[in-house]
């Protein structure tokens, strides 16, 4: 058993049918010694008397808010949550496996640049009685500070007969050095509590591996005289790291016909312009990627040919 926060405790339970459970001793936070009784949640049934209460925690029915009283007055509370292990594996029931980039991916994180700021998100089908708390650091043995905000509900989606809820959090490395080579990964830890169930989820990554630039901005077409060709130009996104001479991007320019089946013409360039043939009813799209490190491509920025 360990303390999650004041008066909230997590009992780690290795569960299997007929498991003996965990013996937990609760102590009433009071100088009083006599006439103390214990109850669980809203029930008035007296579970025991005395300054301490010993319970055997075998299942969620044994978890909840234990309260000690004297003469009708509440003396203190202890909320017991369960962290369940089955077959040697901690439960991961609260969050959905996003299965990308691999199975058992519960947290996904992205950074728009090298400033040390990043966003993580996760999915759940649970709509109520749910709280999250996020901590982060660079490295784990001698951790350097990363400050995370509060997790917020960022999207709701309907998936078949089910609703899916996306939560996200923004974090900022306290002393980020954008140009430095990373040697220690960022660690992100999410505590999730649903009703009386506690679970924790972790992710470890280098900022360079989670970079996903914003799409190029100010995408424009300039027709070339007496030609079907156009000059496409764009700019680095505002959110990308500066100077651009050091934090350089490479770009992919794509000409896509109205039909998805039509052949796509693609050009790769390090410049912020390219010359392409603009077909009728086609659109031109440009996306960006770090020039020197193969992290994610940005989403496409698009304009119609017409």
């Amino acid at each position: 058993i360990w303390e999650l926060k004041k008066d909230v405790y997590v009992v780690e339970l290795d569960w299997y049918p007929d498991a003996p459970g965990e013996m937990v001793v609760l102590t009433c936070d009071t100088p009083e010694e006599d006439g103390i009784t214990w109850t669980l949640d809203q029930s008035s049934e007296v579970l025991g008397s005395g300054k301490t209460l010993t319970i055997q925690v075998k299942e969620f029915g044994d978890a909840g808010q234990y309260t000690c009283h004297k003469g009708g007055e509440v003396l203190s509370h202890s909320l017991l949550l369960l962290h369940k292990k089955e077959d040697g594996i901690w439960s991961t029931d609260i969050l959905k496996d996003q299965k990308e980039p691999k199975n058992k991916t519960f947290l996904r994180c992205e950074a728009k640049n090298y400033s040390g700021r990043f966003t993580c998100w996760w999915l759940t089908t649970i709509s109520t009685d749910l709280t999250f708390s996020v901590k982060s650091s660079r490295g784990s043995s001698d951790p350097q500070g990363v400050t995370c905000g509060a997790a917020t509900l960022s999207a709701e989606r309907v998936r078949g007969d089910n609703k899916e809820y996306e939560y996200s959090v923004e974090c900022q490395e306290d002393s980020a050095c954008p140009a430095a080579e990373e040697s220690l990964p960022i660690e992100v830890m999410v505590d999730a509590v649903h009703k009386l169930k506690y679970e924790n989820y972790t992710s470890s990554f280098f900022i360079r591996d989670i970079i996903k630039p914003d799409p190029p901005k100010n995408l424009q077409l300039k027709p070339l005289k007496n030609s079907r060709q156009v000059e496409v130009s764009w700019e680095y996104p505002d959110t990308w790291s500066t100077p651009h001479s050091y934090f350089s991007l490479t770009f992919c320019v794509q000409v896509q016909g109205k039909s998805k089946r039509e052949k796509k013409d693609r050009v790769f360039t390090d410049k912020t312009s390219a010359t392409v043939i603009c077909r009728k009813n086609a659109s031109i799209s440009v996306r960006a990627q770090d020039r020197y490190y193969s992290s994610s491509w940005s989403e496409w920025a698009s304009v119609p040919c017409s």
């Epitope: 569960w15 299997y16 049918p17 299942e59 969620f60 029915g61 089955e86 029931d93 089908t125 649970i126 078949g160 007969d161 089910n162 609703k163 649903h194 009703k195 009386l196 169930k197």
Partner: nanobody, 123 residues
Framework: EVQLVESGGGVVQAGESLRLSCAAS????????MGWFRQAPGTEREFVAA????????YYADSVKGRFTISRDNAKNTVYLQMSSLKPEDTAVYYC????????????????WGQGTQVTVSS
């Protein structure tokens, strides 16, 4: 919302078997832990059995261990309770319940309930 409808109850002789079914509709059935409870006249609702959302883990009340088997078919959105070697003291209304906390024998840890199906065991 999850809607639960029990079926399969009836009158049987002691020592016989019965299979209860609980059909779920509404939100994704496979996200929920499922349980069976029962209530005899003049008594509190009593835990019978529970099954995890994956169906890989089951939990039983001591009074039914070895006689009752809970199972589920997530493709059919159905949970079953196979009851054998029935005794007169198994007579009760049997309720199906869905929740997110497994294992739990406490009724208020379940969020959704069916209307119940009567099982009568005569001696």
């Amino acid at each position: 919302e999850v809607q639960l409808v029990e079926s399969g109850g009836g009158v049987v002789q002691a020592g016989e078997s019965l299979r209860l079914s609980c059909a779920a509709s509404g939100r994704s059935f496979s996200d929920y832990e499922m349980g069976w409870f029962r209530q005899a006249p003049g008594t509190e609702r009593e835990f019978v059995a529970a099954i995890s959302w994956r169906g890989s883990s089951t939990y039983y009340a001591d009074s039914v261990k070895g006689r009752f088997t809970i199972s589920r078919d997530n493709a059919k959105n159905t949970v079953y309770l196979q009851m054998s070697s029935l005794k007169p003291e198994d007579t009760a209304v049997y309720y199906c319940a869905a929740g997110r906390l497994y294992p739990s024998s406490r009724s208020r840890d379940y969020d959704y309930w069916g209307q119940g199906t009567q099982v009568t065991v005569s001696s």
